[in-house]
């Protein structure tokens, strides 16, 4: 059976403070413990939550925690449930409130010699005791002309006179604590001779050059005086007006009229009433000049049919606040319907194509009127004027694919080639009307093309296949001048492509037939052993049925390829001496020799006095310096081939001869001696 070791018990608690209702359970198996408040399950919150089996209160609340709490333990397996004894809180609290007028019903009814009752709305448990104050001074019960009823929390003044005027407040204290009134009451019982407000001037907004009227009236016995002042304390009377208020008139009833108002008349006007006794009463009102600023521009808007859209009109800054309305085709929009005005917004519901056009937002106040147009376009889904067609385009020529559509706004056209977006470059160009131009059609342009035409309302697309009509061409074109090495085997290739596979054949330019040692094998000219007579002009002819024939002319030169007779050697020279780098080459045509030193070609015309290249090709460098060290390359070339060989040059300091060494001692390394 379930047994409660600790049961919750009723207890005192303080509003807003911590509390704990204890509950401890013993049972044979696991039990689920929860709490009830007036029979309803208690849900955990940050303020009130289960702590183990007990119920913890972070801050007791007199409204939410009033009632009967019960701890419930349940064994889900056996089905047994046990409930603890009931427990509740005796919550102590005190809560501030205002001082209010209980009698008479309104302040307007307070007259001298009437009874006035004030109530202190501070409440609490246990019931607090109250203390009243006038202008911060405590009022003790039994003093003249007032009584305090603590039970009703009332202060009664009988009869009330001007001497009772002041600020009334109250405080209350109990076992819980103390609180003072959250809002105090000002009792004002007028002396008949004091000036009292009958009519107070109100702020006025007027347009420039219009008139403005301020009303002001006081009453007292005997009648009070009334005076008007402008901002700088200048009095305004019908006899003495300040220079900038020449058009001001003060009427017998106290009203002030200003005609043809100008900006300098704007400001604070003070109406001062003075009774026989008491302080002056100063009432203020402001004269504002009406103004209205310009409206911001609208961006043109594009909407889709069937949608709902809103255009907000930001009213211009102005005084008074400008009123705003929308117009279309000169007609003010209604406040309901399909196209209507809501607040400052233009609302278009279930947009139709016919809603397109110019809508105008108007703003107006006393200072004038402003307007701003917004152009609304209703987007339509593009429709076809001309779809792209499957096309045969000629290689090397410009090719065009149409994609002509119409819509509002003007549709955007993009092209795809093999599902890849075509970006405009030197080969592709998309015209304004959507047509794609391929500037010079190439064989690999033969594929699928797709164009997509879009507006905000939607898009359409179509595709077309391009077949490239290949031109008859050499692939690659044969080199117009070629060399063959004398007495060696040589081949001269020639291949071509076209719409149909072309036939290729070689012939001599003079029309003579090829010698028997020269064969034409599927376009490749084969020389088994090159002779001097093989030199000359040859023509490769490619032809097919539909495209005719094309010719390529080749001049074949027979040459003896270059070989070096003398190659430069690795050379070491003393600084200041002369270096000689020898180089001699042979071949047919006779080769020319050039030198490269330190990674630059040595130009014979710009060598300077220290360097010279001989007719036979050798390079001489006089008065060598360390910076002349490096690799030197001899390059031999003719119209048929080119060959090079290189050698390093080292420049070293001349050694100082030692005593033991005779004049005829050899240098330690191979040296050019000059």
């Amino acid at each position: 059976a379930i047994v409660f070791i600790k049961q919750p018990s009723s207890q005192d608690a303080l509003q807003g403070r911590r509390a704990l209702l204890r509950c401890e359970v013993e049972a044979p198996g696991p039990v689920h413990v929860y709490w009830l408040l007036d029979g309803a399950p208690v849900q955990d919150t940050e303020r009130r939550f289960a702590q183990g089996s007990s119920l913890s209160f972070a801050a007791v609340d007199r409204l939410q925690d009033s009632g009967t709490f019960q701890c419930v333990a349940r064994d889900d397996v056996t089905g047994e449930e046990a409930r603890s004894a009931n427990a509740s809180f005796n919550i102590k609290w005190i809560e501030a409130g205002p001082v209010v007028l209980k009698h008479p019903a309104s302040e307007a009814e307070i007259q001298p010699q009437t009874q006035v009752t004030l109530r202190c709305h501070i409440d609490g448990h246990p019931r607090p005791t109250y203390q009243w104050f006038r202008d911060g001074t405590p009022l003790s019960d039994g003093q003249s002309n007032h009584t305090v009823s603590s039970k009703e929390r009332n202060l009664t003044l009988r009869p009330a006179g001007p001497e009772h005027s002041g600020l009334y407040s109250c405080c209350a204290h109990s076992a819980f604590g103390q609180a003072c009134s959250s809002q105090n009451f000002t009792l004002s019982i007028a002396d008949e001779s004091f000036a009292r407000v009958v009519l107070a001037p109100q702020d006025v907004v007027v347009a420039r050059y219009e008139e403005a009227m301020f009303h002001c009236q006081f009453s007292a016995q005997p009648p009070p005086s009334l005076q008007w002042l402008f901002e700088d304390e200048t009095p305004i009377t019908n006899r003495s007006r300040p220079p900038h208020l020449r058009r001001a008139t003060v009427f017998a009833n106290g009203s002030l009229l200003l005609t043809q108002v100008r900006p300098r008349n704007a400001g604070i006007y003070r109406c001062i009433g003075q009774g026989q006794r008491g302080p002056p009463i100063i009432l203020e009102a402001t004269l504002h000049l009406a103004e209205i600023e310009d409206m911001p521009l609208f961006e043109p808007r594009v909407f889709t049919a069937g949608s709902e859209e809103r255009v907000t009109c930001l009213p211009p800054k102005g005084l008074p606040e400008p009123s705003v309305w929308w117009e279309h085709a000169g007609v003010r929009l209604p406040t309901h319907g399909r196209v209507y005005q809501k607040g400052h917004e233009l609302v278009l519901a279930n947009i139709a194509e016919s809603d397109a056009g110019v809508y105008t937002c108007h703003a107006a106040n006393l200072a004038g009127q402003r307007r701003q147009d917004v152009n609304i376009t209703v987007a339509t889904v593009p429709s076809w004027l001309k779809k792209p067609q499957d096309s045969q385009l000629e290689e090397g020529k410009p090719g065009y694919l149409d994609c002509l559509t119409q819509a509002t706004p003007k549709p955007t056209v993009v092209w795809y080639r093999n599902q890849m977006l075509i970006s405009e470059d030197s080969r592709f160009e998309v015209f304004k009307n959507g047509t794609l131009r391929i500037n010079s059609v190439e064989v690999y342009d033969g594929t699928w093309y797709r164009c997509m035409s879009s507006t905000p309302a939607g898009s359409i697309e179509a595709q077309a296949r391009v077949q490239v009509l290949e031109k008859l061409k050499f692939t690659p074109p044969p080199q117009p001048q070629q060399c063959m090495e004398f007495d060696k085997e040589a081949t001269v290739p020639c291949s071509a492509t076209g719409r149909e596979k072309p036939t290729i054949k070689w012939e001599r330019a003079d029309g003579s037939s090829l010698p028997e040692w020269v064969t034409d094998n599927a376009g490749t000219l084969h020389f088994a052993r090159v002779t001097r007579d093989d030199a000359g002009n040859y023509t490769c002819i490619a032809s097919n049925g539909p495209q005719g024939q094309i010719r390529a002319h080749v001049q074949l030169t027979v040459a003896v390829f270059i070989t070096f007779k003398v190659e430069p050697e690795r050379t070491t020279v003393y600084q200041g001496h002369t270096a000689l780098l020898q180089c001699e080459a042979q071949g047919d045509p006779k080769p020319l020799i050039q030198w490269k030193g330190k990674d630059r070609i040595l130009d014979p015309t710009k060598l300077g006095p220290r360097m010279h290249i001989f007719q036979n090709g050798s390079l001489v460098i006089h008065d060598v310096a360390p910076e002349d060290s490096g690799r030197y390359t001899c390059i031999a070339g003719n119209s048929c081939n080119i060959k090079h060989t290189e050698a390093p040059l080292y420049v070293v300091d001349k050694p100082v001869p030692e005593e033991s060494e005779g004049p005829g001692s050899p240098p330690p390394y191979k040296m050019i001696q000059t």
Epitope: A1, D75, D76, V77, T78, G79, E80
Partner: antibody
């Protein structure tokens, strides 16, 4: 432990009241133990209908069976009852009462047929 | 409502085999999960309470494990009397819900 009433053959639209009598044992007080009701239809497994605490009359219903099942209990006879109203063929099933999870009745077969 | 999914729907075993039955919850039920055995034409019988706690009178070959959303009922060396339906049930929240069941049958 828990004795349920016998099988019932009912017409569609009728109501049926199934009883579940607890036989007392040492340390068992009928009023402080929850009686749960479970429905079993072939191919539908077990469905929890709800529960009643006889002492206080507190009940918990599965939202699915609210308006269909009503639980009552009579502490003097240690008997719990479940009334099923507006019967349809979907209500044909074995209905079990259980005290917690340990003790189950033998089940009552309710058949709804025109 | 918390949904309990049992797997497999059917398990064919030979007496002497050891088996594991799975029950998965759609959200955490902590350890508030119980296992029942039901033989044909009989009421359900509680085998394991609170995921892993044994019940007196239930053979020790039945054991349970798991917490949160994944639970297992293990039968070490199945005997012929163990064949029948097995259900899991959660008592974490209302309404209480049962799994669809696993049928343990002789191979």
């Amino acid at each position: 432990q828990l004795e349920e009433s016998g099988a019932e053959l009912m017409q569609p639209g009728a109501s049926v009241k199934v009883s579940c009598k607890a036989t007392l044992e040492e340390g068992y007080t009928f009023t402080v133990y929850w009686i749960e009701w479970v429905k079993q239809r072939p191919g539908h497994g077990l469905e929890w209908i709800g529960e009643i605490l006889p002492g206080s009359g507190s009940t918990d219903y599965n939202e699915k069976f609210k308006g269909k099942a009503t639980f009552t209990a009579d502490s003097s006879s240690n008997t719990a009852y479940m009334q099923l109203s507006s019967l349809t063929t979907e209500d044909s099933a074995i209905y079990y009462c259980a005290r917690g999870k340990l003790h189950w009745g033998q089940g009552t077969l309710v058949t709804v047929s025109a | 409502d918390i949904v309990l999914t049992q797997s497999p729907a059917t398990l064919s075993v030979t007496p002497g085999d050891s088996v594991s039955l799975s029950c998965r919850a759609s959200q955490s039920v902590s350890n508030n999960l119980h296992w029942y055995q039901q033989k044909s034409h009989a009421s359900p019988r509680l085998l394991i309470k609170y995921a892993s706690q044994s019940i007196s009178g239930i053979p020790s070959r039945f054991s349970g494990s798991g917490s949160g959303t994944d639970f297992t009922l293990s039968i070490n060396s199945v005997e012929t009397e163990d064949f029948g339906m097995y259900f899991c049930q959660q008592s974490y929240s209302w309404p209480r819900t049962f799994g669809g069941g696993t049928k343990l049958e002789i191979k």
